[in-house]
Interface confidence: low
């Protein structure tokens, strides 16, 4: 979590002198409570916006907007604390709007916004706006929170952001998978314009089950420049196990910009249509427990064979 680097952060508007400050997320009013505190924000809205850094990099940012309630408590409003919590890491970042003049009622409702929190693709955040000073212990809460899910790099606008492009989002492998005779799968995909290696991760499952019955990894060496954007064809030999018929093929690139952590693409081959009275699937021993998320170290099993070639 960080702030977009280059802009002078502004919160002043006509009728209000205001400055944006870094915050420890622990406002002084927590420690030294005040008797009179403002009411909570109204209509908190979080939207996905995009902003460029001075270097020209494009980042997704959280656009935070809220309004004030039309009550007398705005006379005691000294500012606001904006907090963004990344839910999977518990990382929190805060900034503080410090009002340098007192708010007055005017015809239009007071509205505030801030668009400088950089967010990560595919991550979920909790955004909180706390009016300051914070309430006394057991006082009515004067904050509003909303969760905000950032789209992943598949999203059209996200795809061209710097974090997504450095994860390989512009590469579209256009994977095709076909079942051949003699327990084989033919995998074809488009190589990217970088001399880097790829891994194909094959995981097979029984019909309607999520425990793998076969796993295999195949390594594809780095293509030569004349092979960039060409199709690479790989034939994978499957385990001859009755009922082990649903195959997930995942292609993991190792682009220089993301190495172990590049975006993976996958395709799935479904089991053939089941007859009315399906044969019972024989017992099998899963090679290991189902995948619980893609490890940045690769998964594999020592069985199965494969070969490949680049197709011109």
């Amino acid at each position: 979590l960080r702030l977009l680097d280059h802009r002078a952060l502004v919160c002043s508007q006509p009728g209000l002198n205001c400055t944006v400050k870094n915050s420890t997320c622990l406002d002084d009013s927590w420690i030294h409570p005040r008797n009179l505190t403002p009411s909570s924000p109204k209509d908190l809205q979080i939207q996905l916006h995009f902003a460029h850094t001075q270097q020209g990099d494009l980042f997704p940012v959280a656009h935070i907007e809220w309004t004030l309630q039309t009550d007398a408590s705005i006379l005691y409003l000294e500012g606001a604390e904006l907090s963004v919590l990344q839910l999977n890491t518990n990382e929190r970042l805060c900034v503080k709007f410090q009002f340098l003049s007192m708010l007055q009622h005017h015809r239009k409702r007071w509205r505030f916004s801030f668009s400088h929190f950089v967010v990560d693709p595919g991550q979920e955040y909790e955004v909180t706006v706390h009016h300051l000073p914070k309430p006394i212990p057991d006082g009515d809460p004067n904050h509003q929170s909303k969760n905000f899910l950032v789209p992943d790099c598949e999203h059209a606008r996200m795809k061209v952001t710097t974090p997504c492009m450095s994860s390989g989002s512009l590469w579209d492998p256009n994977i095709t998978v076909e079942t051949l005779e003699a327990h084989q799968l033919r995998v074809s995909f488009t190589l990217w314009n970088e001399s880097t290696h790829y891994q194909i991760l094959l995981t097979s499952f029984p019909h309607m089950e999520n425990h793998s019955c076969f796993e295999h990894m195949h390594h594809i060496p780095a293509p030569r420049p004349e092979e960039f954007h060409q199709r690479s064809n790989v034939t994978l030999t499957l385990r001859n196990l009755k009922g082990c018929c649903r195959h997930q093929v995942q292609i993991q690139p190792f682009f220089s910009s993301c190495l172990n952590d590049c975006l993976r693409h996958s395709a799935t081959v479904s089991c053939p249509e089941m007859p009315d009275t399906p044969e019972p699937i024989p017992d099998y021993m899963p090679l290991w427990e189902p995948r619980s998320g893609s490890s940045d170290y690769k998964d594999d099993d020592d069985k199965g064979s494969s070969h490949h070639h680049h197709h011109h």
């Epitope: 999977n88 890491t89 990560d120 595919g122 991550q123 974090p163 450095s166 994860s167 990894m217 190792f254 910009s257 993301c258 190495l259 172990n260 952590d261 090679l287 290991w288 998320g293 893609s294 490890s295 940045d296 170290y297 690769k298 998964d299 594999d300 099993d301 020592d302 069985k303």
Partner: antibody, heavy 118, light 107 residues
Framework: EVQLVESGGGLVQPGGSLRLSCAAS????????MNWVRQAPGKGLEWVSF????????YYADSVKGRFTISRDNAKNSLYLQMNSLRDEDTAVYYC???????????WGQGTTVTVSS | DIQMTQSPSSLSASVGDRVTITCRAS??????LAWYQQKPGKFPELLIY???TLQSGVPSRFSGSGSGTDFTLTISSLQPEDVATYYC?????????FGPGTKVDIK
């Protein structure tokens, strides 16, 4: 020069907390997954925790699950290990280590010593 | 979880001897295995990855072999500077367990 430098070790009482840091330099830290590995006095290596480059994947050894938290700040080229509810058996030299594309860990820090004792 | 075992736990050999250390995984891990050397008071150093690929800068007297569950680290001609403890580590999926180590010294 590719370098990892750990800090934050020290003497702490059982039940106490420590935060270890690992400062990376000489490579694009934000592109690499990272690990913490520890070694108790006179014992072997024990893998402790893993975090992927964008913090999207995190793993812990069973022995530290629920007590230790791994995190990173790519803007600061830093890796962290927050250690709570420390026990005598957490006494060890703690190393941060960078995984190599293709496997294994090819860059290690010099280690920082954590002693848990009353 | 997959367990890693090493044998022997320690060995003494003469300079110039061929030394073999074995590492066994309780389940198949393909070639997702690394070998490390750790000298007393130092941090570990990667010797071999992908079971048999020599890490850059490592002397050619070190070699690795094996796939699936059984792996071997061989020092073709033991040198005084090879006195160390050697560890294997699996990295196919978490936990990324190390073997208990094999201590090598000179007779």
């Amino acid at each position: 020069e590719v370098q990892l430098v750990e800090s934050g070790g020290g003497l702490v009482q059982p039940g106490g907390s420590l935060r270890l840091s690992c400062a990376a330099s000489g490579f694009t830290f934000s592109s690499y997954s990272m690990n913490w590995v520890r070694q108790a006095p006179g014992k072997g290596l024990e893998w402790v925790s893993f975090i992927s480059a964008r913090s999207s994947t995190i793993y812990y050894a069973d022995s530290v699950k629920g007590r230790f938290t791994i995190s990173r700040d790519n803007a600061k080229n830093s890796l962290y290990l927050q250690m709570n509810s420390l026990r005598d058996e957490d006494t060890a030299v703690y190393y941060c280590a960078r995984p190599k594309v293709g496997g294994g860990m090819d860059v290690w820090g010099q280690g920082t010593t954590v002693t848990v004792s009353s | 979880d997959i367990q890693m075992t090493q044998s022997p736990s320690s060995l003494s050999a003469s300079v110039g001897d061929r030394v073999t250390i074995t590492c066994r995984a309780s389940q198949g891990i393909s070639n997702y295995l690394a070998w490390y050397q750790q000298k007393p008071g130092k941090f570990p150093e990667l010797l071999i990855y992908a079971a048999s690929t020599l890490q850059s800068g490592v002397p050619s007297r070190f070699s690795g072999s094996g796939s699936g569950t059984d792996f071997t680290l061989t020092i073709s001609s033991l040198q005084p500077e090879d006195v160390a403890t050697y560890y294997c580590q699996k990295y196919n999926r978490a936990p990324f367990t190390f073997g208990p180590g094999t201590k090598v010294d000179i007779k």
